[in-house]
Amino acid sequence: IWELKKDVYVVELDWYPDAPGEMVVLTCDTPEEDGITWTLDQSSEVLGSGKTLTIQVKEFGDAGQYTCHKGGEVLSHSLLLLHKKEDGIWSTDILKDQKEPKNKTFLRCEAKNYSGRFTCWWLTTISTDLTFSVKSSRGSSDPQGVTCGAATLSAERVRGDNKEYEYSVECQEDSACPAAEESLPIEVMVDAVHKLKYENYTSSFFIRDIIKPDPPKNLQLKPLKNSRQVEVSWEYPDTWSTPHSYFSLTFCVQVQGKSKREKKDRVFTDKTSATVICRKNASISVRAQDRYYSSSWSEWASVPCS
Amino acid sequence: RAVPGGSSPAWTQCQQLSQKLCTLAWSAHPLVGHMDLREEGDEETTNDVPHIQCGDGCDPQGLRDNSQFCLQRIHQGLIFYEKLLGSDIFTGEPSLLPDSPVGQLHASLLGLSQLLQPEGHHWETQQIPSLSPSQPWQRLLLRFKILRSLQAFVAVAARVFAHGAATLSP
């Protein structure tokens, strides 16, 4: 058993049929010694008396809010949550496996630049009685500070018969050094509580590996005289790290016909313009990637050829 | 050229070669992003290789103030990785494929380090400890981890030279 926060405790249980469970001793937080009784949740049934209560925690029915009273007055509470371990593996029932970039990916994180700011998100099909708390640090043995906000519901989607809820959180490294080469990964830890079930999820990454620039901005076409060619120009996204002479991007320009089956013409360039042939009904798209480190490409920015 | 006295390197040449190094480092291990090395107890290897740290003066302001600190740091790292790529971790069994870019990568590391410190100029003696012996089954993972770290190192070096070529060239 360990304390998650004040008056909230997590009991770690090996979860299998007829498991013996864990013996837990609760102590009433009071100077009083006599006339103390204990109840669980809303029930008025007295579970025991005295300053301490010893219980055998085996299942969710044994978890909940234990309260000690004296003469009708509440003295203190202890909320017990369960953390299940099945076949040596902690349960992951609350969050959905996103399976990208690999199986058992419950948290996904992205950064728009090297400022030390990043966003993580996760998915669940649970709509109520759900709370999340997020902590983060750079490195684990001698951790350096990363500050995370509160997790918020950021999207709802219908997937077949189910509703899926996306939660996200923004974090900022306290003393970020955008130009340095990271040697210690960022660690993100999410505590998830659904009713009386506790689970924790972790992710470990370097900012450089989760970089995904915003799409290029101000994408414009300029027809070239007496030619089917056009000059495409664009700018670095506002959110990208500066100066651009240091934090450089590379770009992919694509000409795509109306039909997905049509051959795509692609050009790669480090410049912020390119000359391409604009076919009728086609569109021109540009995306960006860090020039020197192969992290994710941005989403496409697009304009029609006409 | 970057000589200990403090004259400028051939920023544009360094830019071109460092960008080539980035390409080679990724072609030597393109699938790097799909494997989580931290599951492999990665901290020891990442601790053992050079890193361009915050105080090394490799940020735009540091380069403007005095690029020599950063260039020396990059030079040290290039020599370090050059020695690793020339060791039996890469030359021993299992043999690299004949068309592996590791050979080119090794040569380019040496080339860039010589651009930064031509013959007859010396920052300091480059020392690295004896390498632990490795068996074939260990080498694959060590190669992977070293290339992974090298990708991050040369990315920072390439940014430095790109910025230098754009803003510090005579």
């Epitope: - | 107890g41 020891e44 290897t45 601790n47 053992d48 290789v49 050079p50 890193h51 040290q76 790292g77 020599i79 370090f80 990785y81 690793l84 300091e124 003696t125 480059q126 020392q127 690295i128 400890p129 004896s130 390498l131 632990s132 012996p133 490795s134 068996q135 089954w137 260990q138 060590l142 070293i146």
Partner: antibody, heavy 120, light 113 residues
Framework: QVQLQESGPGLVKPSETLSLTCTVS????????VHWIRQPPGKGLEWIGV???????DYNPSLKSRVTISVDTSKNQFSLKLSSVTAADTAVYYC??????????????WGQGTLVTVSS | DIVMTQSPDSLAVSLGERATINCKPS????????????LAWYQQKPGQPPKLLIY???TRQSGVPDRFSGSGSGTDFTLTISSLQAEDVAVYYC?????????FGQGTKLEIK
Amino acid sequence: QVQLQESGPGLVKPSETLSLTCTVSGFSLISYNVHWIRQPPGKGLEWIGVIWTGGSTDYNPSLKSRVTISVDTSKNQFSLKLSSVTAADTAVYYCARDKYGLFPGYFDYWGQGTLVTVSS
Amino acid sequence: DIVMTQSPDSLAVSLGERATINCKPSQSLLSSGNRKNYLAWYQQKPGQPPKLLIYYASTRQSGVPDRFSGSGSGTDFTLTISSLQAEDVAVYYCLQHFNYPWTFGQGTKLEIK
């Protein structure tokens, strides 16, 4: 928890072979190298040799011709053999571990040591 | 082989006072690439194995009191005990692991004055 325990005869006759075993627990043999170090009574520490995680060995050049270190991974046991011993080999013999990395590491855990006396 | 020379051979310091032990390797232990010094400090009490105090010249092993500190680089290293306690009476050794064979200093015996 991490444990290393040396065992073997406390008395060996001159010209014979000293044989010691180091039994380890609490860590993976794939991640740690195991060393033998000795300390003559009232004197300093001398490194004898190492068996690397891959099974290869390195020995102190001053002892190389007489030393063999081996491992039995199924039993989590390492052995030290030192041939043609003399009174100068009387010492407390320790086994210790270091984390396998690109470069040789420091010894973070040691066994309690076993005293071997060479005498007829 | 790298020769490790410790000084002094023995040292007597009053309780609460600072104790300083030096270690000079015959060649630099600084890896210029990763800027690490491949030197460790050990404490050995009678009848016990050596105990790791400091690694990479200045990093304190977990559980070691913060009165122990390591400093230095290249060919000059120091172990400092800022305020000597009775339980610090022991022999202290430096170890180089830059090149094999690993080599130790000859040891410094620390006593209470």
